[in-house]
Interface confidence: low
């Protein structure tokens, strides 16, 4: 054992294990109703009865599982991320719109817009926005494939945001895409809907930059023919913000002591 | 008491500012010495007089200096990280190398080779090797940029490692990228020269794919008048690694109590 | 956040980053580092208080979770948040070499 | 790593994270949080040894540095590396809310 | 810039209760440590007490029995409860932003108000 | 409780002399003491805390020395705006924020 005599300055304690949980499990009480900003649990009065709502559940489970392409709870985290956000979310409008019409030929690219008005119900104030998810089902993908995210620009321009290497699969996956820049810019703007491309890579003497990832939400030919959406597993953003009622509590970091 | 009756939780204790300060240096001590594995400080004997030689300055100002996309130090860090790393930098193969002819003539890419031989001699095991970073000093750049950057795989096929947004600048900007598992490949296969390309961002349906960006060691035009490196500050491979002779002692963190 | 910028032009009396530099040669008696000649290892001290109990009002001690419990901890800490390295150069023998060693400069403090 | 899989499986009386389920009915009393039912929150423990003065043994004490007191605290503390959110379901007035917690969930410790 | 200014004082009878307050301003008042001190006139700097941003307080021991410090953050207000007043208690009363380093420098007044008079007389 | 003993209890001296005021703690304090100069009709001023560390903004002309009981504040060399009362101050914790009585420094 590496203790010795000249173990002088060991901090070793008896510790009361139980005393320490009690004590965590107080803590843990004020922490998540801190992180509420609640005063005492709220009431439970009007609870209707029966199981959660499905879309509920459904939000929940998107919430709780970790995807590819996210990462853990990001750190240090700012004064401001230190408070519970609330999560919903907005399914990509459906692919009937006209607005998909004149983005139908291209073998590379699909598309994904948005209604912003969806968008700022969730969220009414950019600033309450503390992260926003682009959510793709892939289905299985039979070879890898580079493929990069772009948002829509002024008059069909098109902006690159990022880019994921997806590896082969037999088993249907979910993509998260960082967008919150993006969806904060939305939030600021009047637009009324916005969107997004995924295309495949081209490098620039490449010959073949056929899209071959399968996105739930779409056909596999992706030529015009565009399939019925899939239940609630077509594209969609998921938002983290802040409660418009809670915002006001928060105060810069630098002043806070 | 003097405290007042609700005050039962307080950590309150009385700190000696000196006592602590003393301390931290004293744990500093250890901590130093413990990072590089020597049991008491290494002899002066043998130190050459006069001032430090150019290149080790060269070197450690690098080391020393925070770059464009490089993130400051990772974290949680793995248990082999906590020791030094012995930081070495290899420079890119100069441009009248033979290797250089074939990739002459594109508008859209710039190639850097690098001689394994050299790589080897800086980390003999590719499990030593902790950090790489590929680090390229830009000039002047008069519009935003979008460059990619592949790896040179078998039969002169392009492997897609990341990619950059350079904004526009008047003054130059070390770039550094995060090639390490690229180099510890390298440094497992038995190639003698292997290589990067810097290339434009093309998307499928953009017409001018020129790369606007230049890089020091190459000339503007890039259309196969390669012009002579200009000193130290070629493109290089900034390593960092595990000494040989201290990896023997790194043992795995699950027994290491 | 808890950082030099903060700490250093405050009297933050609750854990902060504490200002610290360490010459290699009159802190440590040592001559054979030779660059730098020392550094800004700063250190993080200051109490995180323990503000949650069953007898505590609620109110009060909501507020301040966020500033000395954010990990709801049974007993708060103040460490280390942000971390920076250091890198020197030496001699072994006649050969000098550069190392980087990680961890060494304290940025900022958190309670945890 | 002093994270879950080694923890939990060994008897380190150091600096480790320990189990720590929280049924939000039985522990806390509350009926009000819909999902989860509960969550392992653990927590850290342990001592982190001060383990360096100028009449210690080197050799003795420097392979401990790496465990004990990697940051050189004057004071090493045993305090959470890794955190992870908590995603919750529950009702304000008839409106079910999700929200996300962050930093709740302790998955590995360190010595700071 | 640091402002405080109390206020509240006056003359009042022995035996009755005065409430003084403190308005700060300049800095962020949750966050920091207050102190009130008085001084009898001709005389010394007496510590009253202290609060701390929880609502956590310290007093001096003889005045544990009559004194009550309080706060209310959302008004950026300090304030000394005073009962049983005698005419020992006749004094120029101070409020002072505590300032320490560390924890035992809770004590060290860093910025103060300039005063209310408070004469306890029949 | 804790007694904090000024000397002396006041002083007459020139511009330009050295003046040293001393206060001594009934029992040990560490560093915990912090000097305060007051002006007539005004609040007392922090001058020096951890019986050593100058205030910000206060001129370098005062210092402070001492640790244990013995503290002594110096004004190497007096200027007309240093004519005031001097206060000791300790706290090394809750129960023992004592001043001393008071130094009044006085134009000779």
């Known amino acids: 054992d590496y203790k010795d005599d000249d173990d002088k300055l060991s901090t070793s304690k008896t510790i009361d294990m139980e005393l320490v949980k009690r004590k965590r499990i107080e803590a843990i009480r004020g922490q998540i109703l801190s992180k509420l900003r609640l005063a005492s649990p709220p009431s439970q009065g009007e609870v209707p009865p029966g199981p959660l709502p499905e879309a509920v559940l459904a939000l929940y489970n998107s919430t709780r599982d970790r995807v590819a392409g996210e990462s853990a709870e990001p750190e240090p985290e700012p004064e401001a991320d230190y408070y519970a956000k609330e999560v919903t979310r907005v399914l990509m409008v459906e692919t009937h719109n006209e607005i998909y019409d004149k983005f139908k030929q291209s073998t590379h690219s699909i598309y994904m817009f948005f209604n912003t008005s969806e968008l700022r119900e969730a969220v009414p104030e950019p600033v309450l926005l503390s992260r926003a998810e682009l959510r793709l089902l892939r289905l299985k993908l039979k070879v890898e494939q580079h493929v990069e995210l772009y948002q829509k620009y002024s008059n069909n321009s098109w902006r690159y945001l990022s880019n994921r290497l997806l590896a082969p699969s037999d088993s249907p996956e979910w993509l998260s895409f960082d967008v919150t820049g993006v969806v904060r810019q939305w939030l600021s703007r009047g637009g009324e809907i916005e969107g997004f491309r995924l295309s495949a890579h081209c490098s620039c003497d490449s010959k073949d930059n056929t899209l071959q990832v399968d996105i739930n939400g779409f056909t596999t030919g992706r030529r015009g023919d565009l399939a019925t959406i899939h239940g609630m597993n077509r594209p969609f953003l998921l938002l983290m913000a802040t409660p418009l009622e809670r915002a006001q509590h928060l105060q810069s970091s630098r002043h806070r002591r | 008491d003097y405290k007042d009756d609700d005050d039962k939780l307080s950590t309150s204790k009385t700190i000696d500012m000196e006592l602590v300060k003393r301390k931290r240096i004293e744990a500093i001590r250890g901590q130093i010495l413990s990072k590089l594995r020597l049991a008491s400080p290494p002899s002066q004997g043998e130190v050459p007089p006069g001032p430090l030689p150019e290149a080790v300055l060269a070197l450690y100002n690098s080391t020393r200096d925070r770059v464009a996309g490089e993130s400051a130090e990772p974290e949680p860090e793995p248990e082999a990280d906590y020791y030094a790393k012995e930081v070495t930098r290899v420079l890119m193969v100069e441009t009248h190398n033979e290797i250089y002819d074939k990739f002459k003539q594109s508008t859209h890419s710039i190639y850097m080779f690098f001689n394994t031989s050299e790589l080897r001699e800086a980390v003999p095991e590719p499990v030593l090797l902790s950090r790489a970073e590929l680090r390229l000093l830009r000039l002047k750049l008069k519009v935003e940029q979008h460059v990619e950057l592949y790896q040179k795989y078998s039969n002169n096929s392009w492997r897609y490692l990341s990619n950059r947004l350079l904004a526009p600048s008047d003054s130059p900007e070390w770039l550094s990228f995060d090639v390490t598992g690229v180099v510890r490949q390298w440094l497992s296969r038995g190639g003698e020269i292997e290589g990067f390309r810097l290339s434009a961002h093309c998307s499928c349906d953009s017409k001018d794919n020129t790369l606007q960006v230049d890089i020091n060691g190459f000339t503007t035009g890039r259309r196969g008048d390669l012009a002579t490196i200009h000193g130290m500050n070629r493109p290089f491979l900034l390593l960092m690694a595990t000494p040989l002779e201290r990896a023997q002692h790194l043992q795995s963190s699950r027994h290491r109590r | 956040a808890l950082d030099t910028n903060y700490c250093f032009s405050s009297t933050e009396k609750n854990c902060c980053v504490r200002q610290l530099y360490i010459d290699f040669r009159k802190d440590l008696g040592w001559k054979w580092i030779h660059e730098p000649k020392g550094y800004h290892a700063n250190f993080c001290l200051g109490p995180c208080p323990y503000i949650w109990s069953l007898d505590t009002q609620y109110s009060k001690v909501l507020a301040l979770y966020n500033q000395h419990n954010p990990g709801a901890s049974a007993a708060p800490c103040c460490v280390p948040q942000a971390l920076e390295p250091l890198p020197i150069v030496y001699y072994v023998g006649r050969k000098p070499k550069v190392e980087q060693l990680s961890n060494m400069i304290v940025r900022s403090c958190k309670c945890s | 790593a002093l994270d879950t899989n080694y923890c939990f499986s060994s008897t380190e009386k150091n600096c480790c994270v320990r189990q720590l389920y929280i049924d939000f009915r039985k522990d806390l009393g509350w009926k009000w949080i819909h999902e989860p039912k509960g969550y392992h929150a653990n927590f850290c423990l342990g001592p982190c040894p001060y383990i360096w003065s100028l009449d210690t043994q080197y050799s003795k004490v420097l392979a401990l540095y790496n465990q004990h007191n990697p940051g050189a605290s004057a004071a090493p503390c045993c305090v959470p590396q890794a955190l992870e959110p908590l995603p919750i379901v529950y009702y304000v007035g008839r409106k079910p809310k999700v929200e996300q917690l962050s930093n709740m969930i302790v998955r590995s410790c360190k010595c700071s | 810039q640091v402002q405080l200014v109390e206020s509240g004082g006056g003359v009042v009878q022995p035996g009755r209760s005065l409430r003084l307050s403190c308005a700060a301003s300049?800095?962020?008042?949750?966050?920091?440590?207050m102190n009130w001190i008085r001084q009898p006139p001709g005389k010394g700097l007496e510590w009253i007490g202290y609060?701390?941003?929880?609502?956590?307080?310290y007093r001096a021991n003889w005045a544990r029995g009559r004194f009550t410090i309080s706060r209310d953050n959302s008004k950026n207000t300090l304030y000394l409860q005073m009962n049983s007043l005698r005419a020992e208690d006749t004094a120029v009363y101070y409020c002072?932003?505590?300032?320490?380093?560390?924890?035992?420098?809770?004590?060290?007044?860093?910025?103060w108000g300039q005063g209310t008079l408070v004469t306890v007389s029949s | 409780d804790i007694q904090m003993t000024q000397s002396p209890s006041s002083l007459s001296a020139s511009v330009g002399d050295r003046v040293t005021i001393t206060c001594q703690a009934s029992?040990?304090?560490?560093?915990?003491l912090a000097w305060y100069q007051q002006k007539p009709g005004q609040p007392p001023k922090l001058l020096i805390y951890?019986?050593?560390t100058l205030e910000y903004g206060v001129p370098s002309r005062f210092s402070g020395s001492g640790s244990g009981t013995d503290f002594t504040l110096t004004i190497s060399s007096l200027q007309p705006e240093d004519f005031a009362t001097y206060y000791c101050?300790?706290?090394?914790?809750?129960?023992?924020?004592?001043f001393g009585q008071g130094t009044k420094v006085e134009i000779k």
């Open positions: 002072a932003r505590g300032w320490h380093i560390f924890d035992h420098h809770y004590w060290v007044m860093h910025a």
């Open positions: 300049g800095f962020h008042f949750s966050s920091e440590a």
């Open positions: 609060i701390y941003t929880s609502g956590t307080t």
């Open positions: 029992q040990s304090i560490s560093t915990y």
């Open positions: 951890a019986a050593s």
């Open positions: 101050q300790s706290y090394s914790d809750g129960d023992s924020v004592i």
